[in-house]
């Protein structure tokens, strides 16, 4: 066998994108590799070129159609192959039978906005992007707030165990700058994982009124 270790991991965004990462110890950075997708019950097949993302890791996106089109369902199986060029031929490096709705990672939430801000409270809303209608309300969210002098890793996680696209942050400090992020995960799928964190939303609480206790 080829020396070292390798890993091939793919996720479906629930609509029209399968993102894959291939890593192999000792593989040359300029190795030319591709991912091929062959669905078991669709007329199309798709290929993407793996591009380096780190020393021994490559990634690519299989774009199956328009961003909001529903290209796969719970009954689909897609056979995914990693092929790398060796001289004049392509060598199969890995093969995976991929059940899209067992391997979900949604797009990061978008359109974060402050709905209402006070001295100690802030109401924030967001939207989910390119999420399948199949989920109906079977989604959960995690949110975190960056306070001054802390890191994101130190921020406590707030869990929303339902499809709730808003949050009311409380016990905030007046006249203070904060940042807020949220991520989403479907309840379905053995290998499903959290979406990336949203872009941070910066906001500032209102100053306390002069002469009043805070």
């Amino acid at each position: 066998a080829v020396n070292g270790t390798s890993q091939f991991t793919c996720f479906y965004n629930s609509r029209a994108n399968i993102s894959c990462v291939w890593s192999q110890d000792g593989a040359l950075q300029d190795t030319s590799c591709q991912v091929h997708a062959w669905p078991d019950r669709r007329r199309w097949n798709q290929t993407c070129e793996l591009l380096p993302v780190s020393q021994a890791s490559w990634a690519c996106n299989l774009i199956l159609g328009a961003p909001d089109s529903q290209k796969l369902t719970t009954v689909d199986i897609v056979t995914l192959r990693v092929l790398c060029r060796e001289g004049v031929r392509w060598r199969v490096m890995a093969i995976q039978d991929f059940k899209p709705f067992e391997n979900l990672r949604l797009m990061a939430p978008i359109s974060l906005q402050v709905v209402h801000v006070e001295t100690h409270r802030c109401n924030i809303s967001w939207e989910i992007s390119q999420a399948s209608h199949y989920f109906e309300r079977h989604l959960e969210f995690e949110a975190r707030t960056l306070s001054p002098g802390h890191t994101w890793e130190e921020a406590p996680l707030l869990t929303l165990k339902q499809k709730q696209e808003w949050i009311c942050l409380e016990t905030l400090t007046p006249d203070t700058q904060y940042e807020f992020q949220v991520r989403v995960k479907p309840l379905q799928g053995e290998f499903t994982t959290w979406s990336p964190w949203s872009q941070p939303l910066a906001f500032r609480t209102k100053p306390a009124a002069l002469g009043k206790d805070t």
């Epitope: 078991d40 199986i77 490096m93 093969i95 039978d97």
Partner: nanobody
Amino acid sequence: QVQLQESGGGLVQAGDSLRISCAASGRIFSNYAMGWFRQAPGKETEFVAGITHLTSTTHYADSVKGRFTISRDNAKNTMHLQMNNLKPEDTALYYCAADRNIKITADWSYWGQGTQVTVAS
């Protein structure tokens, strides 16, 4: 606990056929690709063949293509490797392995103990 148990190895003559098998615990068998690796004395572990768990897509090393056939019996949680036209260079300890992917690297998640295949010239 995952169990992979090989059987069917033995001593055969060059040109003969042999079928080795691998029994797996149910959860592994229904959720993982299965494969065969081999290790000859003094050599590195070599990928032989693999089969995926849902579509039974197969992949073979060039050295065995056309001679070996991998298959799986889902009703019995068993995988087989039918080896025809065996050659002395096929002599090795044959390992059954399971992983989410067929990979040509020998870092699969689960391994059996191995069954010895010896091909005499």
